[in-house]
Interface confidence: medium
């Protein structure tokens, strides 16, 4: 039997043991979570693999998603949304201690898909665990992409109240418009429900006291938001170490200055 | 010191139960997976069965599916595994582990083993 | 018969290399990370390689782990009197849905 033959993708391939992993995830998850505790983990399973399985993994689109947005659907409470952008670690440091806030990665659908890789091949069942495709060599409707695609524009679409962003300050674009949270995010936050966007610049240096709110990037940022008719607030954090320990710790004396 | 503790292991006849015990310490139990993994006398490493943390996944060799069952109760840091109707061929050293299956850390930390003989 | 298959011996002096292999399927050894572990006669398993290549803190560089398709490798360089005992390869099984373990490679340092 000759072996069939297979797209080579420059991307790396599906995640090891990828359906275990989805279904692990998702059971602890409505585990933890009481208000998720109704969701059937098999049949969001089902949904996930239903979006890619079988399809020629450079065109998928939102649309192949919905079923499984559907099932996951969940509300976060106004003023607790936490985005971010090139700097995923510190906000899920900061919203595991600050738990009443809530990044993507904290909701059912972003937890089950945080780190992992998938794709299938076209006409077969099969997951291809060889390669998938990349978003620059390959095309952007990859499943991935189009994946985080689709739940960042409806995790910003839901948001409301007062929106929080965590931006890295290290970067030199500290604001970029083709990151999800410049391309999807910011322009998915709903008006009528959103009052104001406030960015949190993460500063990288110890001894650097520069405001970074200042920076051009900045300004485009809040260009594009107060168009939008949302207002627009920008802080730094000079020390993020300091201010992870605030959050823990509110009452501690050094706290009373700036972070 | 991370430590797993089997106990529960002795002589029993063909068809006969037995209920193996692990208990844990030195780590927060309810954070990790946890397997069973058998040893028969002079052979190889033989996957049991691993249990999530909430209990809610559960997966079984064929050998031993429907007839044994690990459990788990977080509370008393302990993770079981009920025997039934067993046979010569289940007579092995046994070894409970802590196992990072989400992370992909593997097996990490072991137990001692306890012995199982079934024979009449 | 073990599903991955691991030759049942090999030896060698101290300070030599060595390596062994470990030869599997699609829906074991490629599709999945690899694991491997050292036992020592009359003691437990000792986790030694995870995610194919990955050292667990503790575990000496002499050990280093690698996979190419369907097979995969452990090396131990530098071999020490202490290294003799039975290596095991292990993974998850796709189409199984379980692990398995290779038999068992049993090393004799000479």
């Known amino acids: 039997v000759l072996p069939r033959w297979r797209q080579q993708w420059s991307g790396s391939g599906t995640t090891s043991r990828f359906p275990e992993t989805v279904l692990a995830r998702c059971v602890k998850y409505t585990e933890v979570h009481p208000e998720m505790r109704h969701v059937d983990c098999q049949s969001v399973w089902d949904a996930f693999k239903g979006a890619f399985i079988s399809k020629y993994p450079c065109n998928i689109t939102e649309e192949d998603y919905q079923p499984l947005v559907k099932l996951g659907t969940q509300t976060v409470p106004c003023n607790k949304t936490l985005l971010w952008s090139r700097i995923k670690d510190l906000a899920h440091q900061f919203t595991q201690v600050q738990r009443d806030m809530f990044t993507l990665e904290d909701m059912l659908l972003g937890y089950l898909a945080d780190d992992l890789t998938w794709c299938g091949e076209f006409n077969t069942f099969e997951i291809n665990y060889q390669s998938c495709p990349d978003w620059r060599k390959d095309c952007s409707n990859n499943p991935v992409s189009v994946f985080w695609k689709t739940v960042s524009r409806r995790f910003a679409e839901t948001a409301c109240g007062v929106v929080h962003v965590m931006l890295n300050g290290s970067r030199s674009k500290i604001f970029d418009k083709n990151s999800t949270f410049g391309s999807v995010e910011v322009h998915n936050l709903q008006p009528e429900k959103v009052q104001a966007l406030e960015a949190w610049v993460i500063h990288g240096g110890r001894e650097d006291s520069r405001d970074l709110c200042q920076d051009p990037t900045i300004k485009e940022l809040e260009s594009i938001i107060s168009k939008r008719n949302i207002r627009f607030f920008c802080k730094n954090i000079y020390r993020p170490d300091k201010f992870l320990q605030c959050v823990k710790n509110p009452e501690d004396s050094s706290c009373l200055s700036g972070i | 010191e991370v430590l797993l503790l089997e106990s529960g292991g002795g002589l029993v006849q063909p068809g006969g139960s037995l209920r193996l015990s692990c208990a844990a310490s030195g780590f927060t139990f309810s954070d990790y997976w946890m397997s069973w993994v058998r040893q028969a006398p002079g052979k190889g490493l033989e996957w049991v069965s691993t249990i999530s943390i909430s209990a809610g996944i559960i997966y079984y060799a064929d050998s031993v599916k429907g007839r044994f069952t690990i459990s788990r109760d977080n509370s008393k840091n302990t993770l079981y595994l009920q025997m039934n109707s067993l046979r010569a061929e289940d007579t092995a050293v046994y070894y409970c582990?802590?196992?990072?299956?989400?992370?992909?850390?593997?097996?990490?930390?072991w137990g001692q083993g306890t012995t199982v003989t079934v024979s009449s | 018969q073990s599903v991955l298959t691991q030759p049942p011996s090999a030896s060698g002096t101290p300070g030599q290399r060595v390596t062994m292999s470990c030869s599997g399927n699609n829906q074991n050894i490629r599709d999945n990370y690899v694991y491997w572990y050292q036992q020592v006669p009359g003691t437990a398993p000792k986790l030694l390689i995870y995610k194919d290549d990955q050292r667990p803190s503790g575990v000496p560089d002499r050990f280093s782990g690698s996979k190419s398709g369907t097979s995969a490798s452990l090396a131990i360089s530098g071999l020490q009197s202490e290294d003799e005992a039975d290596y095991y390869c292990a993974t998850w099984d796709g189409s199984l849905k379980a692990r398995v373990f290779g038999g068992g490679t049993k090393l004799t340092v000479l």
């Open positions: 582990a802590k196992d990072n299956w989400n992370d992909y850390y593997g097996m990490d930390v």
